[in-house]
Amino acid sequence: MAVTACQGLGFVVSLIGIAGIIAATCMDQWSTQDLYNNPVTAVFNYQGLWRSCVRESSGFTECRGYFTLLGLPAMLQAVRALMIVGIVLGAIGLLVSIFALKCIRIGSMEDSAKANMTLTSGIMFIVSGLCAIAGVSVFANMLVTNFWMSTANMYTGMGGMVQTVQTRYTFGAALFVGWVAGGLTLIGGVMMCIACRGLAPEETNYKAVSYHASGHSVAYKPGGFKASTGFGSNTKNKKIYDGGARTEDEVQSYPSKHDYV
């Protein structure tokens, strides 16, 4: 029962997380113009991984894609790569985890196969979450560095009469979405790995073996001894999914949430 709940919850949390990673990757507001201590401009600049946008006070918004590949900073390329790897791993993880769900029966799939698939998807979710967190953190670090560099520039080289206000950028909404989404995917992955331990059929009942001691007719029969590897409760003889808190119909509704992935 607890294993199914953990697995199901891990799947749902990871699903939300991956949807968030996709949303963050597509969002334009990775960095936004810093308005604090700045002259009030009638133009608001913000940038994403794929394009930069300008919103005018008139309400018009103009976005321009980064049509060059070689001309982009290596860090931006690295962030793009991390986010895409995170999405791909997450999507594969979701696909694998659907078939691994204990409440979904596919032919005569063994519990051991489901346990392996659960572990695989869990690891994929963990790596996916780490990729997203790393990508967002690299971008955030890049912003902080550039922010202080441009702040230094603002207060130097002002010898002339004409001032040129340098646009400084600060954290955009996408960074927070990315961090939260990456964290959720990571948590979901950990939950899947925990559920895997509960799914693994680790019990082995050793057959009784008679040891004939010389000169004695005493038989040692340690029958029923459980060899455990510390993976938790035995699931071989328990139908955990019977009478569980979640019906098959309810669980079947989850995959529809990630049709767009």
Partner: antibody
Framework: QVQLVQSGAEVKKPGASVKVSCKAS????????VHWVRQAPGQGLEWMGY????????KYSQEFQGRATLTSDKSASTAYMELSSLRSEDMAVYYC???????????WGQGTLVTVSS | DIVMTQSPDSLAVSLGERATINCKSS????????????LTWYQQKPGQSPKLLFF???TRQSGVPDRFSGSGSGTDFTLTISSLQAEDVAVYYC?????????FGQGTKVEIK
């Protein structure tokens, strides 16, 4: 065609208030910001402020903050500019205009002359 | 506030001749986000409302004759009428559209010599 039609000329006494209307036609009123600009006789143009009819968001020039009130009526596709505590130096032609790319003003009303005289 | 300074205050040019109006802002009007200059040029004929000529310093508004051209970047801008026509007699204004409050130049009166 796109046009902004303003209310007629007004004569007011010092200390009074004036409310000028600007009716938009030929476009979706809520899709464009409306600015107000004034021009004293023989003088240059002076920006007063703007209102976004979509969300009633407004911004004022410091000089008119607290004295001018910009409002709009979506159902009537009309923007309003009310100026209180009128002084003789407020005598001017008041224009409404529609905001365009680059925060420029592409369509202007015909202007409303406000005369302040005791 | 941003100060917009136009020169000259008035200009008398012969028909068919070139007229050049300069506009200088106290701060750069170049937006780094889209590399566009937020400067607008207007024409105001006697007794009429202003008419938009150029936005983003050099983007011509539809219906504006191509004898008009706008140029410049940062703080220095120019409006040029390559061949002055009788109907071009007007006052020309530049406007800062980058910083609040939006400010206009004092205007340049163009007349026929």
């Amino acid at each position: 065609q796109v046009q902004l039609v303003q209310s007629g000329a007004e004569v007011k006494k010092p200390g009074a208030s004036v409310k000028v209307s600007c009716k938009a036609s030929g476009y979706t009123f809520t899709s464009y910001v409306v600015h107000w600009v004034r021009q004293a006789p023989g003088q240059g143009l002076e920006w007063m402020g703007y209102i976004n009819p979509y969300n009633a968001d407004s911004k004022y020039s410091q000089e008119f903050q607290g004295r001018a009130t910009l409002t709009s009526d979506k159902s009537a596709s009309t923007a309003y500019m009310e100026l209180s505590s009128l002084r003789s130096e407020d005598m001017a032609v008041y224009y409404c205009s529609r905001s365009y790319y680059g925060n420029s003003f592409d369509v202007w009303g015909q202007g409303t002359l406000v005369t302040v005289s005791s | 506030d941003i100060v917009m300074t136009q020169s000259p205050d008035s200009l008398a040019v012969s028909l068919g001749e070139r007229a050049t109006i300069n506009c200088k802002s106290s701060q750069s009007l170049l937006n780094s986000g889209n590399q566009k200059n937020y400067l607008t040029w207007y024409q105001q004929k006697p007794g009429q409302s202003p008419k938009l000529l150029f936005f983003w310093a050099s983007t011509r508004q539809s219906g504006v004759p191509d004898r008009f051209s706008g140029s410049g970047s940062g703080t220095d801008f120019t409006l040029t009428i390559s061949s002055l026509q009788a109907e071009d007699v007007a006052v020309y204004y530049c406007q800062n559209d980058y910083y609040f409050p939006f400010t206009f130049g004092q205007g340049t009166k163009v007349e026929i010599k």
